[in-house]
């Protein structure tokens, strides 16, 4: 779990959660909940998909990711601090006990408050430990590199958003220097 | 109401590639849940799926057409776009857009009213 | 993959008539099939979506059932604005298919 995935209030949380499709290409069921991960299916369930649709979800709640390869990473929309804590993801392997098993930590902070605009091109010394967890970010955050300038407290908000290899290069193209890793 | 819109040349030249592309409006494009898809129908025949993106970026192309399509996104104009490299005369069809949603996968809910294209010199 | 066979491939019929058409997998594809109709110059609409559930703001007279390999579309009543083609489509295996259409013409 270590430190967990930190989100600020009302900013969307993605949780990333992913498996190898089998040789047959048959979709895995899976489970998200709220809550570690119990011995047998998922408790406080916000998703569940099946081998060949998602067929449950609330209303927050959505895969970030492409299912139908595998990508089952969870997005959690317009977080409050009741979101805080332990998600499970559950791959669903068929036969007794093949489950594949994630407790996932999510910390929700209180959202700061947005000073005057700061111009910062590089990113690098303030930062330097950004994009540091694989997967897709949230949409929001994705034309990000279109903007000609980003105040230092929009990157800090956003840091825990930023996680597409797409949005690295949008960054790289706006003249941002980033390190990933 | 959701509505997607295909565009682009109506004429292709043998060999060339073929670009189109779909703007969505309406509807939630920019977040999970739903997939963009190209079919094509060649005139007088049946439908052929071609490929779809997700909102990820994820792909996936019908094998029949893998090695000459690709599939984009641009969530900031609401839009995908096909391309169809090295195309022939069989590839005259109209081109539709549609969409389908994870909760009911490769059913095609809402479709573009279709853009006839022809490959002739 | 699969392929769908649909017949007859032309159905002639009056309005007020019972229309009935069917759709046959090569292998089975459960209850994973759905009905499209399609207008000259249109788009295909979404009728039925696994084989026996109407999409929203479908009619009443149109009834899909069937499962495994054998589907049929059902019109109880055709209306004047029912001729058109009519596809099923499969989306049991990937990639998702369809068959080759029914036409539905005035007699």
């Known amino acids: 779990l270590e430190d967990g995935y930190k989100v600020e209030v009302g900013k969307n949380a993605y949780l990333p959660c992913s498996y190898t499709l089998p040789t047959s290409g048959t979709l895995v069921p899976v489970c998200w909940g709220k809550g570690a991960c119990p011995v047998f299916e998922c408790g406080n369930v916000v998703l569940r998909t099946d081998e060949r649709d998602v067929n449950y979800w609330t209303s927050r709640y959505w895969l970030n990711g492409d299912f139908r390869k595998g990508d089952v990473s969870l997005t959690i929309e317009n977080v409050t601090l009741a979101d805080s804590g332990i998600y499970c993801c559950r791959i669903q392997i068929p036969g007794i006990m093949n489950d594949e098993k994630f407790n996932l930590k999510l910390v929700i902070k209180p959202a700061k408050v947005t000073p005057a605009p700061t111009r910062q091109r590089d990113f690098t010394a303030a930062f330097p430990r950004m994009l540091t967890t694989r997967g897709h970010g949230p949409a929001e955050t994705q034309t990000l590199g279109s903007l000609p300038d980003i105040n230092l407290t929009q990157i800090s908000t956003l840091a825990n958003e930023l996680r597409d290899s797409r949005l690295a290069n949008d960054l790289r193209d706006s003249g941002a220097t980033i390190r990933i890793g | 109401q959701v509505q997607l819109q295909e565009s682009g040349p109506g004429l292709v030249k043998p060999s060339e590639t073929l670009s189109l592309t779909c703007t969505v409006s309406?509807?939630?494009?920019?977040?999970?849940?739903?997939?963009w898809n190209w079919i094509r129908q060649p005139p007088g025949k049946g439908l052929e799926w071609i490929g779809y993106i997700y909102y990820s970026g994820s792909t996936n192309y019908n094998p029949s057409l893998k090695s000459r399509v690709t599939i984009s996104l641009d969530t900031s104009k609401n839009q995908f776009s096909l391309k169809l490299s090295s195309v022939t005369a069989a590839d005259t069809a109209v081109y539709y857009c549609?969409?389908?949603?994870?909760?009911?996968?490769?059913?095609?809910?809402?479709w573009g009213q279709g853009t006839l294209v022809t490959v002739s010199s | 993959e699969i392929v769908l066979t649909q017949s007859p491939a032309t159905l002639s019929l009056s309005p007020g008539e019972r229309a009935t058409l069917s759709c046959r997998a090569s292998q089975s594809v459960s209850s994973y099939l759905a009905w499209y109709q399609q207008k000259p110059g249109q788009a295909p609409r979404l009728l039925i979506y696994?084989?026996?559930n109407r999409a929203t703001g479908i009619p009443a007279r149109f009834s899909g059932s069937g499962s495994g390999t054998d589907f049929t579309l059902t019109i109880s009543s055709l209306e004047p604005e029912d001729f058109a083609v009519y596809y099923c489509q499969q989306r049991s295996n990937w990639p998702p298919t369809f068959g080759q259409g029914t036409k539905l013409e005035i007699k």
């Open positions: 549609a969409r389908d949603h994870y909760s009911s996968s490769w059913t095609f809910d809402y």
């Open positions: 309406g509807g939630s494009f920019s977040r999970g849940g739903y997939y």
């Open positions: 696994d084989a026996s």
